[in-house]
Protein backbone atom coordinates (compact mmCIF):
# COMPACT_ATOMS: atom_id res chain seq x y z
CA UNK A 1 0.00 0.00 0.00
CA UNK A 2 1.04 3.62 -0.42
CA UNK A 3 3.02 5.38 2.27
CA UNK A 4 0.79 7.80 4.19
CA UNK A 5 2.25 10.11 6.85
CA UNK A 6 0.38 11.91 9.61
CA UNK A 7 1.44 13.35 12.98
CA UNK A 8 1.50 11.01 15.94
CA UNK A 9 -0.24 13.38 18.37
CA UNK A 10 -2.47 16.46 18.11
CA UNK A 11 -4.13 18.40 20.89
CA UNK A 12 -7.56 19.81 20.08
CA UNK A 13 -8.19 23.46 20.81
CA UNK A 14 -10.42 24.56 23.68
CA UNK A 15 -13.18 24.94 21.09
CA UNK A 16 -12.93 21.27 20.12
CA UNK A 17 -11.08 21.76 16.84
CA UNK A 18 -8.17 19.57 15.76
CA UNK A 19 -6.12 19.97 12.59
CA UNK A 20 -3.45 17.76 11.07
CA UNK A 21 -1.73 17.12 7.75
CA UNK A 22 -2.08 13.84 5.90
CA UNK A 23 0.62 13.36 3.26
CA UNK A 24 0.86 10.51 0.78
CA UNK A 25 3.54 9.34 -1.64
CA UNK A 26 1.77 8.79 -4.94
CA UNK A 27 3.16 5.98 -7.10
CA UNK A 28 1.35 7.30 -10.17
CA UNK A 29 -0.50 10.23 -11.69
CA UNK A 30 -3.86 10.11 -9.96
CA UNK A 31 -6.53 12.61 -10.97
CA UNK A 32 -9.18 11.48 -8.49
CA UNK A 33 -8.30 10.97 -4.83
CA UNK A 34 -10.46 9.84 -1.93
CA UNK A 35 -9.52 10.76 1.63
CA UNK A 36 -11.23 9.12 4.59
CA UNK A 37 -10.75 9.76 8.29
CA UNK A 38 -11.32 6.68 10.43
CA UNK A 39 -11.50 6.50 14.22
CA UNK A 40 -10.17 3.35 15.83
CA UNK A 41 -11.14 2.36 19.35
CA UNK A 42 -9.96 -1.09 20.38
CA UNK A 43 -11.08 -3.38 17.55
CA UNK A 44 -13.81 -1.02 16.30
CA UNK A 45 -13.24 1.22 13.29
CA UNK A 46 -15.75 3.91 12.37
CA UNK A 47 -15.74 6.38 9.51
CA UNK A 48 -15.59 9.96 10.72
CA UNK A 49 -15.76 11.64 7.31
CA UNK A 50 -14.73 11.20 3.69
CA UNK A 51 -14.20 13.36 0.63
CA UNK A 52 -13.31 12.72 -3.00
CA UNK A 53 -11.51 15.41 -4.94
CA UNK A 54 -9.98 15.97 -8.33
CA UNK A 55 -6.29 16.86 -8.22
CA UNK A 56 -5.94 20.62 -8.36
CA UNK A 57 -9.45 21.17 -7.04
CA UNK A 58 -10.66 21.78 -3.51
CA UNK A 59 -11.49 19.05 -1.06
CA UNK A 60 -15.25 19.00 -0.45
CA UNK A 61 -16.86 17.18 2.45
CA UNK A 62 -20.63 16.80 2.80
CA UNK A 63 -22.42 19.81 4.30
CA UNK A 64 -23.20 17.97 7.54
CA UNK A 65 -19.65 16.66 7.94
CA UNK A 66 -17.61 17.52 11.01
CA UNK A 67 -14.54 17.70 8.76
CA UNK A 68 -13.18 20.37 6.47
CA UNK A 69 -10.00 20.31 4.48
CA UNK A 70 -7.77 21.70 1.80
CA UNK A 71 -5.45 19.89 -0.59
CA UNK A 72 -2.13 20.86 -2.09
CA UNK A 73 -0.33 18.35 -4.25
CA UNK A 74 0.04 15.16 -2.23
CA UNK A 75 -0.84 16.87 1.05
CA UNK A 76 -4.26 17.14 2.62
CA UNK A 77 -4.86 19.52 5.54
CA UNK A 78 -7.68 18.09 7.62
CA UNK A 79 -9.70 19.83 10.34
CA UNK A 80 -12.15 18.03 12.61
CA UNK A 81 -14.61 20.18 14.52
CA UNK A 82 -17.07 19.70 17.36
CA UNK A 83 -14.81 17.37 19.33
CA UNK A 84 -15.41 16.60 23.00
CA UNK A 85 -13.36 14.76 25.61
CA UNK A 86 -15.18 11.51 24.80
CA UNK A 87 -13.90 11.81 21.19
CA UNK A 88 -10.28 11.45 22.30
CA UNK A 89 -8.78 8.63 20.27
CA UNK A 90 -6.79 7.44 17.28
CA UNK A 91 -7.76 9.07 13.98
CA UNK A 92 -6.44 7.32 10.89
CA UNK A 93 -5.99 8.93 7.49
CA UNK A 94 -6.83 6.63 4.59
CA UNK A 95 -5.96 7.72 1.05
CA UNK A 96 -7.19 6.00 -2.12
CA UNK A 97 -6.11 6.85 -5.66
CA UNK A 98 -9.38 6.16 -7.44
CA UNK A 99 -8.64 7.16 -11.02
CA UNK A 100 -7.06 6.42 -13.39
CA UNK A 101 -6.07 2.79 -12.72
CA UNK A 102 -4.22 1.27 -11.04
CA UNK A 103 -6.01 1.60 -7.71
CA UNK A 104 -3.73 2.38 -4.78
CA UNK A 105 -4.62 2.54 -1.12
CA UNK A 106 -2.63 3.79 1.83
CA UNK A 107 -3.29 3.87 5.56
CA UNK A 108 -1.53 6.20 7.97
CA UNK A 109 -0.37 5.06 11.40
CA UNK A 110 -2.96 7.30 13.00
CA UNK A 111 -3.00 10.58 14.92
CA UNK A 112 -3.87 10.41 18.59
CA UNK A 113 -6.17 13.38 19.13
CA UNK A 114 -6.56 14.54 22.73
CA UNK A 115 -9.64 16.57 23.52
CA UNK A 116 -10.11 18.28 26.86
CA UNK A 117 -13.52 19.74 27.61
CA UNK A 118 -13.18 23.36 28.77
CA UNK A 119 -13.96 24.09 32.41
CA UNK A 120 -17.30 25.85 32.76
CA UNK A 121 -16.88 29.50 33.63
CA UNK A 122 -17.62 30.20 37.32
CA UNK A 123 -20.65 32.39 38.00
CA UNK A 124 -19.68 36.00 38.37
CA UNK A 125 -21.20 38.47 40.80
CA UNK A 126 -20.06 41.44 38.78
Amino acid sequence: AMHVAQPAVVLASSRGIASFVCEYASPGKATEVRVTVLRQADSQVTEVCAATYMMGNELTFLDDSICTGTSSGNQVNLTIQGLRAMDTGLYICKVELMYPPPYYLGIGNGTQIYVIDPEPCPDSDF
Epitope: A1, P27, K29, S43, I92, P102, L105, I107
Partner: antibody, heavy 115, light 108 residues
Framework: EVQLVESGGGLVQPGRSLRLSCTAS????????MNWVRQAPGKGLEWVGQ??????????YYSDSVKGRFTISRDDSKSIAYLQMNSLKTEDTAVYYC??????WGQGTTVTVSS | DIQMTQSPSSLSASVGDRVTITCGAS??????LNWYQQKPGKSPKLLIY???NLADGMPSRFSGSGSGRDYTLTISSLQPEDVATYYC??????????FGGGTKVEIK
Protein backbone atom coordinates in the same frame (compact mmCIF):
# COMPACT_ATOMS: atom_id res chain seq x y z
CA GLU B 1 -6.28 -2.10 -24.99
CA VAL B 2 -4.48 -3.27 -21.87
CA GLN B 3 -2.37 -6.37 -22.37
CA LEU B 4 -0.03 -8.34 -20.16
CA VAL B 5 1.69 -11.28 -21.82
CA GLU B 6 3.68 -13.77 -19.74
CA SER B 7 6.31 -15.97 -21.36
CA GLY B 8 9.17 -18.25 -20.38
CA GLY B 9 7.24 -21.07 -18.74
CA GLY B 10 7.93 -24.73 -19.41
CA LEU B 11 9.15 -28.01 -17.96
CA VAL B 12 12.18 -27.80 -15.68
CA GLN B 13 13.92 -30.20 -13.32
CA PRO B 14 13.99 -29.62 -9.55
CA GLY B 15 16.90 -27.44 -8.49
CA ARG B 16 17.15 -25.69 -11.85
CA SER B 17 16.29 -22.11 -12.77
CA LEU B 18 13.78 -20.39 -15.03
CA ARG B 19 13.08 -16.75 -15.89
CA LEU B 20 9.57 -15.56 -16.67
CA SER B 21 8.86 -12.33 -18.53
CA CYS B 22 5.76 -10.15 -18.50
CA THR B 23 5.42 -7.73 -21.40
CA ALA B 24 2.93 -4.91 -20.87
CA SER B 25 1.12 -2.59 -23.24
CA UNK B 26 -1.90 -0.30 -23.26
CA UNK B 27 -1.22 1.40 -19.92
CA UNK B 28 1.48 3.42 -18.18
CA UNK B 29 3.75 0.63 -17.02
CA UNK B 30 5.98 2.90 -14.91
CA UNK B 31 3.00 3.96 -12.74
CA UNK B 32 2.28 0.39 -11.74
CA UNK B 33 3.51 -1.84 -8.99
CA MET B 34 3.94 -5.21 -10.70
CA ASN B 35 2.97 -8.43 -8.96
CA TRP B 36 3.37 -12.12 -9.65
CA VAL B 37 0.62 -14.48 -8.55
CA ARG B 38 0.58 -18.24 -9.03
CA GLN B 39 -2.00 -20.99 -9.03
CA ALA B 40 -1.06 -24.62 -8.51
CA PRO B 41 -3.21 -27.18 -10.40
CA GLY B 42 -6.68 -27.33 -8.85
CA LYS B 43 -5.71 -24.88 -6.09
CA GLY B 44 -6.35 -21.26 -5.18
CA LEU B 45 -4.39 -18.09 -5.90
CA GLU B 46 -1.09 -17.44 -4.11
CA TRP B 47 0.59 -14.04 -4.13
CA VAL B 48 4.27 -14.55 -4.99
CA GLY B 49 5.78 -11.10 -4.84
CA GLN B 50 5.79 -7.48 -5.91
CA UNK B 51 8.10 -4.85 -7.33
CA UNK B 52 7.16 -1.23 -6.76
CA UNK B 53 8.02 1.62 -9.10
CA UNK B 54 10.55 4.44 -9.18
CA UNK B 55 8.81 6.71 -6.61
CA UNK B 56 9.07 3.74 -4.23
CA UNK B 57 12.70 2.99 -5.13
CA UNK B 58 11.77 -0.27 -6.86
CA UNK B 59 11.22 -1.97 -3.50
CA UNK B 60 10.57 -5.72 -3.73
CA TYR B 61 8.51 -8.00 -1.49
CA TYR B 62 8.13 -11.77 -1.54
CA SER B 63 5.99 -14.47 0.03
CA ASP B 64 7.77 -16.65 2.58
CA SER B 65 7.46 -19.66 0.28
CA VAL B 66 9.74 -18.12 -2.39
CA LYS B 67 11.89 -15.69 -0.39
CA GLY B 68 15.58 -16.19 -1.15
CA ARG B 69 14.86 -18.24 -4.28
CA PHE B 70 12.84 -15.88 -6.50
CA THR B 71 13.75 -12.36 -7.63
CA ILE B 72 11.47 -9.82 -9.31
CA SER B 73 12.89 -7.07 -11.50
CA ARG B 74 11.57 -4.64 -14.09
CA ASP B 75 12.66 -2.64 -17.10
CA ASP B 76 10.45 0.43 -17.41
CA SER B 77 12.00 1.41 -20.76
CA LYS B 78 10.75 -1.87 -22.26
CA SER B 79 7.59 -2.22 -20.10
CA ILE B 80 8.68 -5.67 -18.96
CA ALA B 81 8.64 -7.31 -15.53
CA TYR B 82 10.67 -10.41 -14.78
CA LEU B 83 10.47 -13.29 -12.32
CA GLN B 84 13.77 -15.09 -11.86
CA MET B 85 13.12 -18.47 -10.23
CA ASN B 86 16.09 -20.37 -8.79
CA SER B 87 16.32 -23.66 -6.85
CA LEU B 88 12.93 -24.71 -8.17
CA LYS B 89 10.90 -27.27 -6.24
CA THR B 90 8.09 -29.57 -7.38
CA GLU B 91 5.69 -27.45 -5.29
CA ASP B 92 6.49 -24.43 -7.51
CA THR B 93 4.51 -26.14 -10.31
CA ALA B 94 1.74 -23.67 -11.19
CA VAL B 95 0.34 -21.20 -13.66
CA TYR B 96 2.14 -17.90 -13.08
CA TYR B 97 0.27 -14.63 -13.66
CA CYS B 98 1.70 -11.14 -13.71
CA UNK B 99 -0.50 -8.24 -12.68
CA UNK B 100 -0.31 -4.48 -13.10
CA UNK B 101 -1.33 -3.07 -9.74
CA UNK B 102 -3.93 -5.72 -9.07
CA UNK B 103 -6.15 -4.25 -11.78
CA UNK B 104 -4.73 -5.90 -14.89
CA TRP B 105 -3.93 -9.61 -15.25
CA GLY B 106 -2.08 -11.57 -17.90
CA GLN B 107 -3.22 -14.90 -19.32
CA GLY B 108 -0.61 -16.82 -17.35
CA THR B 109 2.30 -19.10 -18.24
CA THR B 110 2.63 -22.68 -16.98
CA VAL B 111 5.69 -23.80 -15.04
CA THR B 112 6.10 -27.53 -14.39
CA VAL B 113 8.87 -28.67 -12.06
CA SER B 114 9.43 -32.38 -12.41
CA SER B 115 12.25 -34.86 -12.82
CA ASP C 1 1.20 -12.13 8.70
CA ILE C 2 -2.49 -11.35 8.37
CA GLN C 3 -4.58 -14.41 7.50
CA MET C 4 -7.66 -14.24 5.25
CA THR C 5 -10.46 -16.73 5.89
CA GLN C 6 -13.08 -17.06 3.18
CA SER C 7 -16.38 -18.91 3.48
CA PRO C 8 -18.06 -20.95 2.25
CA SER C 9 -15.48 -22.83 0.16
CA SER C 10 -18.23 -23.72 -2.30
CA LEU C 11 -21.93 -23.07 -2.80
CA SER C 12 -24.71 -24.03 -5.17
CA ALA C 13 -27.61 -21.65 -5.76
CA SER C 14 -30.43 -21.14 -8.23
CA VAL C 15 -30.56 -18.47 -10.92
CA GLY C 16 -31.97 -15.31 -9.37
CA ASP C 17 -30.85 -16.15 -5.85
CA ARG C 18 -29.02 -13.69 -3.65
CA VAL C 19 -25.55 -15.04 -2.90
CA THR C 20 -23.25 -13.90 -0.09
CA ILE C 21 -19.58 -14.74 0.36
CA THR C 22 -17.65 -13.64 3.43
CA CYS C 23 -13.99 -12.92 4.04
CA GLY C 24 -12.51 -12.40 7.48
CA ALA C 25 -9.09 -10.96 8.27
CA SER C 26 -7.11 -11.93 11.37
CA UNK C 27 -6.48 -8.21 12.01
CA UNK C 28 -8.15 -4.92 11.10
CA UNK C 29 -7.39 -4.11 7.44
CA UNK C 30 -9.28 -0.80 7.07
CA UNK C 31 -11.11 -1.74 3.87
CA UNK C 32 -7.87 -2.69 2.11
CA LEU C 33 -9.49 -5.62 0.36
CA ASN C 34 -10.10 -6.66 -3.23
CA TRP C 35 -12.40 -9.33 -4.67
CA TYR C 36 -11.60 -11.26 -7.86
CA GLN C 37 -13.66 -13.44 -10.17
CA GLN C 38 -12.04 -16.37 -11.94
CA LYS C 39 -14.14 -18.20 -14.49
CA PRO C 40 -13.16 -21.80 -15.36
CA GLY C 41 -10.01 -21.92 -17.49
CA LYS C 42 -9.56 -18.13 -17.41
CA SER C 43 -7.37 -15.58 -15.66
CA PRO C 44 -8.75 -13.85 -12.56
CA LYS C 45 -10.39 -10.46 -13.02
CA LEU C 46 -10.62 -7.61 -10.54
CA LEU C 47 -14.24 -7.46 -9.37
CA ILE C 48 -14.33 -5.15 -6.33
CA TYR C 49 -11.51 -2.90 -5.11
CA UNK C 50 -11.13 -1.14 -1.79
CA UNK C 51 -13.88 -3.35 -0.29
CA UNK C 52 -16.78 -1.48 -1.90
CA ASN C 53 -15.88 -0.16 -5.36
CA LEU C 54 -17.10 -2.03 -8.43
CA ALA C 55 -14.40 -2.52 -11.07
CA ASP C 56 -15.01 -1.21 -14.59
CA GLY C 57 -17.06 -3.53 -16.76
CA MET C 58 -18.41 -5.62 -13.90
CA PRO C 59 -22.21 -5.96 -13.57
CA SER C 60 -23.97 -3.90 -10.89
CA ARG C 61 -25.47 -7.03 -9.32
CA PHE C 62 -22.09 -7.46 -7.61
CA SER C 63 -21.42 -5.40 -4.51
CA GLY C 64 -18.92 -5.34 -1.68
CA SER C 65 -19.31 -4.24 1.90
CA GLY C 66 -17.62 -4.47 5.26
CA SER C 67 -15.05 -2.77 7.47
CA GLY C 68 -12.56 -3.62 10.15
CA ARG C 69 -11.98 -7.36 9.92
CA ASP C 70 -15.13 -8.59 8.17
CA TYR C 71 -16.05 -8.22 4.50
CA THR C 72 -18.81 -9.48 2.22
CA LEU C 73 -19.27 -9.98 -1.50
CA THR C 74 -22.90 -10.09 -2.59
CA ILE C 75 -24.44 -11.16 -5.90
CA SER C 76 -27.95 -9.72 -5.76
CA SER C 77 -29.40 -12.02 -8.45
CA LEU C 78 -27.24 -14.95 -9.52
CA GLN C 79 -26.86 -15.40 -13.28
CA PRO C 80 -25.49 -18.41 -15.22
CA GLU C 81 -22.44 -16.38 -16.29
CA ASP C 82 -21.53 -15.85 -12.61
CA VAL C 83 -20.34 -19.46 -12.30
CA ALA C 84 -16.76 -18.93 -11.15
CA THR C 85 -14.45 -19.03 -8.16
CA TYR C 86 -14.29 -15.82 -6.13
CA TYR C 87 -11.26 -14.75 -4.11
CA CYS C 88 -10.69 -11.99 -1.58
CA UNK C 89 -7.26 -10.46 -1.09
CA UNK C 90 -5.78 -8.20 1.56
CA UNK C 91 -3.91 -5.28 -0.05
CA UNK C 92 -2.67 -3.60 3.13
CA UNK C 93 1.04 -3.02 3.63
CA UNK C 94 3.23 -4.62 4.57
CA UNK C 95 2.97 -7.51 2.15
CA UNK C 96 2.29 -10.43 1.79
CA UNK C 97 -0.92 -9.55 0.01
CA UNK C 98 -2.64 -12.76 1.06
CA PHE C 99 -5.59 -14.28 -0.80
CA GLY C 100 -8.52 -16.06 0.79
CA GLY C 101 -8.98 -19.73 -0.05
CA GLY C 102 -11.65 -19.06 -2.68
CA THR C 103 -15.37 -19.76 -3.02
CA LYS C 104 -16.59 -21.86 -5.94
CA VAL C 105 -20.06 -20.76 -7.07
CA GLU C 106 -22.22 -23.19 -9.06
CA ILE C 107 -25.78 -23.15 -10.39
CA LYS C 108 -28.29 -25.66 -8.97
Amino acid sequence: EVQLVESGGGLVQPGRSLRLSCTASGFTFSDNWMNWVRQAPGKGLEWVGQIRNKPYNYETYYSDSVKGRFTISRDDSKSIAYLQMNSLKTEDTAVYYCTGGMDYWGQGTTVTVSS
Amino acid sequence: DIQMTQSPSSLSASVGDRVTITCGASEIIYGALNWYQQKPGKSPKLLIYGATNLADGMPSRFSGSGSGRDYTLTISSLQPEDVATYYCQKILSPPPWTFGGGTKVEIK
